[in-house]
Interface confidence: medium
């Protein structure tokens, strides 16, 4: 035997260590009640407390609930581990339009490039398909196999990462090319309404159902605990969260302890009649004619927008803007007012409430 080989049974008589034949070395024996963080712990810091299933030990040594990927549009990217949360991402064919900690609050289908456009970059779980005009002389049927990578779902065009233009820019502003970084910077500067629920938050074991900590009498952090699917409104009353159970609605944000669930029209539809935290009537999104061209627009929601030919050439198509003039919405469902006779147009995101005027043209409902 080599002289430095530890005596197997006793590790040189040290009761706080044991010999692991698999790794052929002495390992630290975790105290009763603690679990090793690796196969052969070497020191006390390699031992930890054990959390419940579906909980992980966070940086503060707290057992924290792993996020769940139970929504239909999510899949598990990485599992819940002892020291890290489960990570969810949008399922194949969809991308994340509103991120959340270790998950995605809102997934949209990848765009299908319209006629005359080809795929520049295929969609991923994080980014939408990026389309570009087909090169002159190149058949739209595919210049290369890469350009044929389109989702099989027949969804309407929806998103391209583009910069947010200042509200002061005019209709004649030229599109900004290669503006993804600008868009990200602009999007990061958008402010959320003070009372709107943030989709980014620490996972909790019972979101929306109970306080985050025990509530001793007289504590300033106490709040009334409402029933599941109820939230505490500004007047301190337990109010039922809206339901998104209609076929044409999807959940935008979940029911939380201090905010209602919010619903929006499912992909491919826009809101014709708005309702508090929801939409009373969804109508199919108008599909633009073949000659429309993908145009950079608003990054914040990543909804695909198209540059329309000169106004008046497509009376039945919902034209999209030269610039994204919409401010960050302060309501759960974006509300914009559009003058259908105006010489310049505004973006109509899929979540915006739209009323069809007597002329048949879409007019955004201020809600």
């Amino acid at each position: 035997f080599p002289q430095d080989r530890p005596f197997e049974d006793t590790c040189h008589g040290n009761p706080s260590h044991y010999y692991d034949k698999a790794v052929r070395r002495c390992c630290y024996r975790c105290p009763m009640g603690l679990f090793p963080t690796q196969q052969c712990p070497q020191r006390p810091t390699d031992c930890r407390k054990q959390c419940e299933p579906d909980y992980y030990l966070d940086e503060a040594d707290r057992c924290t609930a792993c996020v769940t990927c139970s929504r239909d549009d999510l899949v598990e990217k990485t599992p819940c581990a002892w020291n890290s949360s489960r990570v969810c991402e949008c399922r194949p064919g969809m991308f994340c339009s509103t991120s959340a900690v270790n998950s995605c609050a809102r997934c949209f289908f990848h765009s299908v490039c319209p006629a005359g456009m080809i795929v520049k970059f295929p969609g991923t779980a994080q980014k939408n398909t990026v389309c570009e005009p087909a090169s002159p002389g190149v058949s739209p049927a595919c210049a290369s196999p890469e350009n044929c990578k389109e989702p099989s779902s027949g969804t309407i065009p929806q998103a391209k990462p583009t910069p947010v233009s200042p509200a002061t820019s005019s209709a004649s502003t030229m599109p900004v090319r290669g503006g993804t970084r600008l868009a990200q910077e602009a999007a990061s500067k958008l402010t959320r309404a003070p009372d709107s629920p943030s989709s980014v938050g620490r996972p909790s074991s019972d979101p929306g159902l109970s306080p985050t900590q025990p509530c001793p009498e007289g504590s300033g952090d106490c709040r009334k605990q409402c029933e599941p699917d109820y939230y505490l409104d500004e007047a301190g009353r337990c109010t039922a969260c809206v339901s998104c159970s209609r076929d044409d609605l999807v959940e935008k944000t979940p029911c939380a302890w201090n905010s209602s669930r919010t619903c929006e029209c499912r992909p491919g539809m826009i809101c014709a009649t708005s309702a508090t935290n929801s939409c009373a009537r969804c109508v199919p999104y108008p599909i633009c004619a073949a000659e429309t061209v993908t145009k950079p627009q608003d990054m914040a929601e990543k909804d695909t927008t198209f540059e329309a030919p000169p106004l008046g050439t497509q009376p039945d198509c919902n034209p999209t803007p030269e610039n994204g003039e919409a401010p960050a919405s302060t309501s759960p469902t974006q509300s914009l007012l559009v003058d259908s006779q105006a010489s310049k147009t505004l973006p109509i995101p899929t979540s915006a409430p739209v009323a069809l005027s007597s002329t048949g043209k879409p007019v955004l409902d201020a809600g």
């Epitope: 009763m32 009640g33 679990f35 407390k49 419940e52 299933p53 579906d54 057992c63």
Partner: antibody, heavy 119, light 111 residues
Framework: EVQLVQSGAEVKKPGSSVKVSCKAS????????MNWVKQAPGQGLEWIGQ????????NYNGKFKGRVTLTADKSSSTAYMELSSLRSEDTAVYFC????????????WGQGTLVTVSS | EIVLTQSPATLSLSPGERATLSCRAS??????????MLWYQQKPGQPPKLLIY???NVETGIPARFSGSGSGTDFTLTISSLEPEDFAVYFC?????????FGGGTKVEIK
């Protein structure tokens, strides 16, 4: 030998609070989750929550959270369960129980504390 | 929360007979290759006593006549030959999700 010894029976009026103690001995108190379980007369068992004495971390059953506070004093190896705004349906035997790591079972239990809520 | 349904509510048997107790969960209790199902025995005036953990592992000191089986959502506690001291109430418990929940219990009584 592992032992969990609970405080004696209590009679309380509706609306008041009760604090039940559970003194542990014979093991590393800080390293095991301490669970609390309710058993109403002639009824089944109901999990209230648990506390990790090492750092005060807690998990609660939503049904009790807000009225129940779990605490632990490492210096005396004692866990506490305080139940506020008592009502008649809180009349029950309350058990503390040590949770094993690995299989999550509760291997050692206190003898139970009967709390009677009556006006 | 996960609902556990125990059946039968009462089992009337004689000493020496075989007892089969069932516990069904409203969703799977599987967790990294094991089922987080536990069985306890409780006698009047006493706290529950751990019998089985991880669905089929017998706790140290528990007689070999006790065994547990099942996975996913369906679990069984079997007492191969009832002894007089086995007449008690038996509870199943799940630890798969917070909050942990118990079944309503099965009372094994002398026939």
């Amino acid at each position: 030998e592992v032992q969990l010894v609970q405080s004696g029976a209590e009679v309380k009026k509706p609306g008041s609070s009760v604090k039940v103690s559970c003194k542990a001995s014979g093991y590393a108190f800080s390293s095991y989750w301490m669970n609390w379980v309710k058993q109403a007369p002639g009824q089944g068992l109901e999990w209230i929550g648990q506390i990790y004495p090492g750092d005060g971390d807690t998990n609660y059953n939503g049904k009790f959270k807000g009225r129940v506070t779990l605490t632990a004093d490492k210096s005396s190896s004692t866990a506490y369960m305080e139940l506020s705004s008592l009502r008649s349906e809180d009349t029950a035997v309350y058990f503390c129980a040590r949770r094993i790591n690995g299989n999550f079972a509760m291997d050692y239990w206190g003898q139970g504390t009967l709390v009677t809520v009556s006006s | 929360e996960i609902v556990l349904t125990q059946s039968p509510a009462t089992l009337s048997l004689s000493p020496g007979e075989r007892a089969t107790l069932s516990c069904r969960a409203s969703e799977s209790l599987e967790y990294y290759g094991t089922s987080l199902m536990l069985w306890y025995q409780q006698k009047p005036g006493q706290p529950p006593k751990l019998l089985i953990y991880s669905a089929s592992n017998v706790e140290t000191g528990i007689p070999a006549r006790f065994s547990g089986s099942g996975s996913g959502t369906d679990f069984t506690l079997t007492i191969s030959s009832l002894e007089p001291e086995d007449f008690a109430v038996y509870f199943c418990q799940q630890r798969r999700k917070v909050p942990s929940t118990f079944g309503g219990g099965t009372k094994v009584e002398i026939k």
